[in-house]
Amino acid sequence: ALDTNYCFRNLEENCCVRPLYIDFRQDLGWKWVHEPKGYYANFCSGPCPYLRSADTTHSTVLGLYNTLNPEASASPCCVPQDLEPLTILYYVGRTPKVEQLSNMVVKSCKCS
Amino acid sequence: ALDTNYCFRNLEENCCVRPLYIDFRQDLGWKWVHEPKGYYANFCSGPCPYLRSADTTHSTVLGLYNTLNPEASASPCCVPQDLEPLTILYYVGRTPKVEQLSNMVVKSCKCS
């Protein structure tokens, strides 16, 4: 699986999850998030050679097409597969509120 | 929606579904498919600027991060959203068989 366990431990050029730390204020301009100050959102990148973690029959077909037609511009792309939520603390006036934001952290990638 | 209705009628540079015809024998080396000889598999391509058909909170966050940090290499990618099956005819010896292959045709795209 192209997950953090594998990708963060290997120098992998092909499609894999990469570490990306985002600071809410500096990187997004979000002043309303009190805690955490930032988080590892991560991202997916790297080429999708034929059959690498193909998501659907279409991505397998497209990968095969690309292999047999190297001049083709159509190829699968490395995108998030498994995402996890992030729990944040913010304030409504002086009242603290805890919220779980869904699909905030990339845990693994796929070729789609 | 970044679907065939919209994308095939507009000269859209950003993420959109593009027409791609695949000939089973010539492009994939599949001799076992009798009919059709080929089909429009289509593919997704084009940049994913901030908020363009963002798939998840993560892709929205990543798009915003990319906008505010133009030097960043992390950005969402244009990939299939809706896929449709394709019905094919193949032969087992001299006996014809009909099969529906799932997820073969891209109908719309998203930024993921």
């Epitope: 095969l64 | 994939l28 032969y91 010896g93 006996t95």
Partner: antibody, heavy 120, light 108 residues
Amino acid sequence: QVLLVQSGADVRKPGASVKIFCKASGYTFTSNVISWVRQTPAQGFEWMGGVIPIVDIANYAQRFKGRLVLTADTSTNTAYMELRSLKSADTAVYYCASTLGLVLDAMDYWGQGSLVTVSS
Amino acid sequence: EIQMTQSPSSLSASPGDRVTITCRASQSLGSSYLAWYQQKPGKVPKLLIYGASSRAPGVPSRFSGSGSGTDFTLTISSLEPEDAATYYCQQYADSPITFGQGTKLEIK
């Protein structure tokens, strides 16, 4: 060059199952069809079935239907043959082979064979 | 299922001889659903002929196939010592694929 490498010899008890793998290299696995054939001194060659790897379509010989499962994993270029409810008559050398392209076809490349012995 | 019957079941011939093996199907295969294989002891089968008459890549020209319908032949025009093997025909017109029982060829 094209290579089909199969798992090694196996001994099983009657009623058990056996699963054999067939790993392909040197050609486009997903463009071909993989057939499974077994050979015994008594029955000669028997075709068991075939699988189209990329779409996982399997076709089985009638006599094996219900206890034979053919699958393929395109990510590892590997085909699998699982035979259940083994009988002593299933003792044979099992071969995977790539066909010339059709579901039923001549077979141009063969694995080295996997001897399965069914004995109590 | 289609039965395939080979004849002879065994034969012995000398280097340079012309050898013919026949294969009869229990029902018509048309003109192109037949293959021939060579198998040496302890080895895997090797495809010689497909489509009744097309030689597989790398197969010497002394091997040829012919026939249609129910009757097919494999001919070795000039026997070589390395041709000692068992030869099998195979039909792929209908499921299940079936094979002949084999013809064992010995070199004198």
